[in-house]
């Protein structure tokens, strides 16, 4: 977890941001908190992005002020207005795009002083994998599918019984471009599977790591999935 703390000047306030990742096509949150003020009208929040001339978002005197908002963010940003008074300056970002990646600054002014902190925002695509037994195959085969990834991830199979085994020779992974021509569907097939074993399909890129587990016994099949964002840093 990378946390950013920003302090500025003699009359300074602490501003804290958390680096995060956005899943393209979905909504994202750029997290920022600050020492609260008792009067909403005294709080100014400015979100800026490195390399962008206009503002990402501005909130002051108790309302949004977007006359200087940059065109790339029009109609796509909102603060949690009812939470500003308690020190939440986090920004909601609609329909995250690849181009939203970059360094953002959360700049705060209150009656107590000023402060700012930077935030690294990564963008890509990540989704939960699902592992199933492929009954159409001639031998016992597992099929791991995840609908949306970008950049192209690596896929690694592992097994509880054969810990440390390399399954690259008995697996086949393909990447199929989705209709929006950015994200890809990941399909990986594992051959020569034995029963009474737990297999894991691990998909990872520089933004996220996801695992799909399947336990195959003679009497039942159990599945579990997990997704973890990488490099969440606060500053």
């Amino acid at each position: 977890l990378i946390i950013g703390f920003g302090i500025s000047g003699r009359h300074s306030i602490t501003v804290t941001t958390v680096a995060s990742a956005g899943n393209i096509g979905e909504d994202g949150i750029l997290s920022c908190t600050f020492e609260p003020d008792i009067k909403l009208s005294d709080i100014v929040i400015q979100w800026l992005k490195e390399g962008v001339i206009g503002l990402v978002h501005e909130f002051k005197e108790g309302k949004d002020e977007l006359s200087e908002q940059d065109e790339m963010f029009r109609g796509r940003t909102a603060v949690f207005a009812d939470q500003v008074i308690v020190g939440n300056a986090s920004l909601r970002l609609k329909n995250v795009q690849l181009t939203d990646a970059g360094t953002y600054k959360c700049y705060i002014i209150t009656s107590k002083g000023k402060g700012n902190a930077n935030l690294e925002y990564k963008t890509g695509a990540f989704s939960m994998p699902e592992v199933n037994v492929d009954y159409n195959a001639s031998s016992e085969t597992l099929r791991c599918e995840a609908p949306r990834w970008f950049p192209q991830p690596t896929v690694v199979w592992a097994s509880q019984v054969d810990q440390g085994a390399n399954f690259s020779e008995v697996s086949n992974t393909s990447f199929e471009l989705n209709s929006e021509n950015v994200t890809m569907k990941v399909v990986s097939v594992l051959y020569n599977v034995t029963i009474n074993n737990t297999y894991s399909c691990m998909i990872e890129n520089d933004i996220a790591k996801a695992t799909g587990d399947i336990k195959v016994t003679e009497s039942e099949i159990k599945r579990r999935s997990h997704l973890q964002l990488l490099n969440s840093k606060a500053s």
């Epitope: 096509g25 949004d64 002020e65 977007l66 006359s67 200087e68 065109e71 109609g75 940003t77 909102a78």
Partner: antibody, heavy 119, light 107 residues
Framework: QMQLQESGPGLVQPSQSLSITCTVS????????IHWVRQSPGKGLEWLGV???????DYNAAFISRLSISKDNSKSQVFFKMNSLQSDDTAIHYC?????????????WGQGTLVTVSS | NIVMTQSPKSMSMSVGERVTLSCKAS??????VSWYQQKPEQSPKLLIY???NRYTGVPDRFTGSGSATDFTLTISSVQAEDLADYHC?????????FGSGTKLEIK
């Protein structure tokens, strides 16, 4: 109290242009975008375009060649202009404001102005 | 353009009955779906935004649900004053689009 009010000509000759003004009160045009939606007689709603707080616009591609939206923040007025009207442009035209700064739902609507295209 | 398909086109219900209106998007729109009630000779009124958030002052018999492509507006116990057209709309991507509406009649 948030209010929007359209004022328009009512009747427009075919091939002529339509101008409607939307006057707002209770909020600032530098905080929220204003959308334009129309409804043809007995038909559904059709989104035409929006002018955002910054003054930038987004239009429905079907109307982009003949539609322009502008505003005067100090007068709290938004101006809608559509050229080359035909009879199938007969509709009630509404201006509307979103519930948040992200387009999530139109919470405030004008009363609508019926525009009839006829000679 | 994203097509919003509403069903049924019209329905007739008795007071107190449960009403379910459907809205299907031709592609994923996340939760950027809103529902509007429009009574004769009136402007549309927002009922639900963000797929499931009830707008201020809307009676709690109105409930919205769904995400991605399938959305539902439920009226738990329909009242005489609910006679109206109901429209769904998406604001996920341009151009924003609306369904063709469902006309609710009261028996």
């Amino acid at each position: 109290q948030m209010q929007l009010q359209e004022s328009g000509p009512g009747l427009v000759q075919p091939s002529q242009s339509l101008s409607i003004t939307c006057t707002v009160s209770g909020f600032s045009l530098t905080s929220y975008g204003i959308h334009w939606v129309r409804q043809s007689p007995g038909k559904g709603l059709e989104w035409l375009g929006v002018i955002w707080s910054s003054g930038s616009t987004d239009y429905n591609a079907a109307f982009i060649s003949r539609l322009s939206i502008s505003k005067d923040n100090s007068k709290s007025q938004v101006f809608f202009k559509m050229n080359s009207l035909q009879s199938d442009d007969t509709a009630i035209h509404y201006c509307a404001r979103d519930i948040t700064t992200i387009a999530e739902g139109f919470a405030y609507w004008g009363q609508g102005t019926l525009v009839t295209v006829s000679s | 353009n994203i097509v919003m398909t509403q069903s049924p086109k019209s329905m007739s219900m008795s007071v107190g009955e449960r009403v379910t209106l459907s809205c299907k998007a031709s592609e994923n729109v996340g939760t950027y779906v809103s529902w509007y009630q429009q009574k004769p000779e009136q402007s549309p009124k927002l009922l639900i935004y963000g797929a499931s958030n009830r707008y201020t002052g809307v009676p709690d018999r109105f409930t919205g649900s769904g995400s991605a492509t399938d959305f539902t507006l439920t009226i738990s116990s329909v009242q005489a004053e609910d006679l109206a057209d109901y429209h769904c709309g998406q604001s996920y991507s341009y151009p924003f689009t609306f369904g063709s509406g469902t006309k609710l009649e009261i028996k």
